[in-house]
Interface confidence: low
């Protein structure tokens, strides 16, 4: 029925080709030396390229960019639920490849796979009940949001549920897990002495990724899951429910993904794209599904699972939330309601489906094999007022700009791809496919990837997560731009950030965080080692304790939530327009690649530092067994004065030299390559970089030296400590080894 | 109430033209994809043809491609099937459906989970 042919980067090929073919011949017409040839080749580039200056150029690009527009383009993409695998979200691609091409892109192709997706069944809804002991349901749980004034009739509304829950109606008493986090088990199993084996376990939103509370809760044995948003965490005080404001009403509900892919993309071709001809796994062998039944509520039905609660008391006020009930733990209902059970009725389906990304090109006018890319995803859980379209809404504009630029004869440096991804609340799958597909022409010419999902979590302060390598181009592009923020009128962005979200380490500077995961920049960073980096306005972290944003994936999401309550005047939307955009901008522009390697020396320090702290809490076993971190601290002492040397060479050489030059951005371009272990880190092979790891307790957060860190984790506990300690040392040789030969490419070639 | 009510069923010879209409209530009918399936007579369900929310996109089962096309009128809620040329083998009761609400299922044709149907209208073709 479908019958689409798959695009490839044919097309991109053959049009690059007359150019070189034309001036391959005037090379041996001319019988020109190759040398002379190349230095005529790249100075021609260059000056094509730069035909006004450098700087007019970025303030052209930044001018360009418009809050109106970005405003229009939000309410555009958020008329409709654009769900990953629909008709819908197959239209919107198709009108943003067209309008891309609008801009004035070189070309927009659409590219296709068939994933595992899954959706509820519409004849069969999923819920959750109170049984009396004749199996009578006396409550069930509502079967979808109430619609937000305006959007009652509209259809294509997928109620809350949990993608790629099994099917299944389990049964039992309930035990509370708080967060169900690594340590609220542990506090429940070994110091309250519960068992959740065999029952169904209710755990609030919030603190750490959906996907790791369920592994948590089959790990401890439980057969059922059910997610609540507390008012605690989705709730702030002194602001009114939506539509009078930004909070989450009772009757709204959290989707998400409750996957642990670590990495894998679509969890039946892992390693490989779902093209027409992959090998696709049996659903039994199939990546990071859940193996027990879950599903979400809000928080009225929340209140009357947990107001029965009976059993042990929580064991501190970390473990109650802002719910009228007691947070006991369980098991089971109190008193007159101990016969009462839960009842669980998931009928999901997870389902191959077609998905599609949009790959839009700016070829680069001197070094077109050398790719800046830029990428968000398109498709939401309902309208995505938020996540995402206030990201596709920015990278909308930012095509607009660079095509303007294009269209009056300017051309960047190196080639800028966009993207608009596919099912990435499906577990980041349009980027990963298409990065499986490309990951050879990636690894070899990917110099940056920038992230682009949601522009605002709030309207407080800039938030920067990024590769160290990024750091000084973050800095002085902020320094550049205005803030938006009331009290800071004629102030930097710098300013701002750096009042409102200071470094914890270094005075005077803002706080920029590690990558983790959870977003579509992993496969590039995580996996092939691109250097990549994430902008968005957030809250006051300080004053805001709730969780994400209260009206996270859920059916208030929309675009008046944006355009009421959180950037009436698109004003946030613009800057992080003109951070992201800048940031591309620089990367592909620059003569010289923006990273500065002495800022990744400085996080090795410390990481080495953090890391041999925790282990230095076990002091008596690392003299048993001999575990030194002496290596580790000489390879980053080495990595250190190698940066330090390279980047006075940086300084120094003859930026005129077009082989000096490309060897000086290649060797800064590979080296985020360098961190990348091939074997992977343990159990998660497409976790490679041995720097940075999603958490293993939390696919949000990022963890430096991962693999030490998980081999050191819970140590005490372990049956065998001399072969824990032994993976221990294993752990330290991969990273002194890494960090080692990461240094070496920055050495001098000859 | 939800419902869709096919009509313009009939008999008809071989080659001649017959144009089925499906009209929606009760739902946003502008807003969903729609379906026509239909059931030869001791057969199964076979699907024949699909046209997205806005009618940009149309799908046909290699059986009737060229011969049967499928069109939609939002303002009246109204959804429609021109067949032309037809065969003996297209005599079946003719059912439109409703795609489910996440939307059609890309890549596939077969195993839809429609979640209304019409009643369905009898097109006989004989001489």
């Known amino acids: 029925m479908w019958n689409l042919l798959h695009e490839t980067d044919s097309a991109v090929a053959t049009a690059r080709r007359p150019r070189w073919l034309c001036a391959g011949a005037l090379v041996l017409a001319g019988g020109f030396f190759l040398l002379g040839f190349l230095f005529g080749w790249f100075i021609k580039s260059s000056s094509e390229a730069t035909n006004i200056t450098p700087k007019h150029n970025m303030k052209a690009f930044l001018d360009e960019l418009k809050a109106e527009n970005i405003k229009k383009f939000l309410h555009n993409f958020t008329q409709i639920p654009h769900l990953a695998g629909t008709e819908q979200n197959f239209q919107l691609a198709k009108q943003i490849q067209s309008q891309w091409k609008e801009f004035g892109l070189d070309s927009v192709e659409l590219t296709h796979y068939d994933v595992l997706l899954s959706y509820p069944n519409k004849t069969h809804p999923n819920y959750i009940s109170i049984i009396n002991e004749d199996g009578n349901e006396i409550f069930n749980t509502s079967l979808f949001e109430p619609p937000p004034a305006g959007y009652e009739n509209v259809s294509d509304i997928v109620p809350p549920f949990s993608a790629f829950s099994p099917q299944g109606m389990p049964e039992g008493d309930l035990v509370y897990v708080n967060y169900a986090r690594t340590e609220d088990f542990f506090k429940l199993e070994r110091d309250m002495k519960i068992n959740c084996s065999g029952k169904i376990v209710i755990a609030r939103y919030g603190k750490v990724f959906r996907g790791n509370k369920v592994k948590n809760a089959q790990l401890a044995g439980a057969t059922g899951v059910i997610l609540y948003s507390d008012p605690a965490d989705y709730f702030a005080p002194g602001v009114k429910s939506y539509p009078d404001g930004w909070n989450l009403p009772g009757g709204g509900v959290q989707r998400g993904n409750i996957l642990n892919l670590n990495g894998a993309g679509d969890p039946l071709t892992p390693g490989y794209p779902a093209n027409e001809y992959a090998y696709r796994r049996g659903i039994a062998e199939a990546v990071g599904l859940p193996s027990i039944p879950v599903h979400p509520i809000g928080y009225y039905d929340a209140q009357k699972l947990l107001e029965k609660m009976g059993g042990s008391a929580s064991p501190d006020s970390s473990w109650r939330g802002s719910l009228k009930v007691p947070y006991n733990v369980g098991p089971g209902f109190t008193g007159n309601f101990s016969t009462q059970k839960v009842k669980m009725h998931i009928h999901s389906t997870s389902e191959v489906t077609r998905i599609y990304n949009v790959i839009g090109t700016l070829r680069g006018a001197v070094e077109p094999d050398r790719y800046v890319i830029l990428g968000g995803h398109r498709d939401s859980w309902v309208f995505g007022g938020i996540d995402p379209q206030s990201g596709a809404a920015v990278v909308h504009e930012i095509v607009r700009s660079f095509g303007t630029l294009k269209k009056e004869g300017w051309r960047p440096r190196r080639t800028i791809l966009f993207a608009s991804w596919d099912a990435e609340e499906f577990g980041l799958l349009g980027s990963t496919e298409w990065a499986e597909e490309n990951s050879r022409l990636l690894q070899e010419r990917g110099v940056a990837y920038i992230n682009a999902d949601s522009s605002i979590e709030g309207n407080y302060t800039l938030r920067v997560d990024c590769t160290p390598l990024m750091y000084s181009l973050v800095y002085n592009l902020t320094k550049e731009l205005e803030s938006p923020d009331e009290g800071f009128e004629g102030k930097s962005l710098y300013e701002s950030w750096t009042k409102k979200s200071p470094s914890p380490e270094f005075s005077g500077m803002p706080r920029i965080s590690k990558l983790g995961s959870g977003n579509d920049f992993e496969v590039f960073f995580q996996r092939l080692g691109i250097a990549s980096g994430r902008a968005r306005y957030t809250k006051n972290w300080e004053t805001n304790k709730f969780s994400s944003y209260p009206l996270y994936h859920s059916v208030y999401e929309t675009y008046e939530l944006v355009e009421k309550f959180y950037d009436p005047m698109f004003k946030y939307h613009l800057t992080v327009a003109q951070v992201r955009g800048g940031m591309v901008f620089e990367l592909a522009n620059s003569v010289v690649l923006p990273f500065d390697c002495r800022d990744y020396a400085v996080v090795l320090r410390k990481y080495a530092d953090k890391i041999y702290n925790i282990s230095m809490k076990h002091p008596q076993e690392m003299k048993t067994y001999s575990v030194s971190f002496d290596s580790l601290f000489s390879a980053v002492k080495n990595f250190t004065e190698i940066a330090s040397k390279f980047s006075e060479r940086l300084r120094d050489f003859d930026k005129s030299n077009p082989i000096l030059l490309r060897m000086m951005n290649d060797q800064l371009m590979f080296l985020e390559r360098a961190f990348i272990d091939p074997l992977g880190l343990p159990d998660r092979p497409f976790y490679r970089h041995v720097i940075y790891a999603p958490s293993s307790h939390n696919k949000y957060a990022g963890e430096s030296f991962p693999g030490i860190y998980d081999a050191l984790f819970d140590i005490e506990s372990k049956v065998d400590p001399s072969q824990a300690w032994g993976e221990v040392k294993r752990q330290i040789s991969i990273a002194t080894f890494t960090v080692q030969a990461a240094a070496e490419t920055l050495s001098e070639v000859a | 109430e939800v419902q869709l009510v096919e009509s313009g069923g009939g008999v008809v010879q071989p080659g001649r033209s017959l144009r089925l209409s499906c009209a929606a209530s009760?739902?946003?009918?502008?807003?969903?994809?729609v379906h026509w399936v239909r059931q030869a007579p001791g057969k199964g369900l076979e699907w024949v043809a699909y046209?997205?929310?806005?009618?940009?996109?149309?799908y046909y089962a290699d059986n009737v491609k060229g011969r049967f096309t499928i069109s939609r009128d939002n303002s009246k809620n109204t959804l429609y099937l021109q067949m032309n040329s037809l065969r003996a083998e297209d005599t079946a009761v003719y059912y439109c459906?409703?795609?489910?609400?996440?939307?059609?299922?890309?890549?596939?044709?077969?195993?839809?989970?429609?979640?209304?149907w019409g009643q369905g209208t009898m097109v006989t073709v004989s001489s």
């Open positions: 009760g739902f946003s009918f502008s807003g969903y994809g």
């Open positions: 046209i997205s929310y806005d009618a940009s996109n149309k």
């Open positions: 459906a409703k795609d489910p609400a996440w939307g059609l299922r890309l890549g596939e044709s077969s195993s839809y989970d429609f979640d209304i």
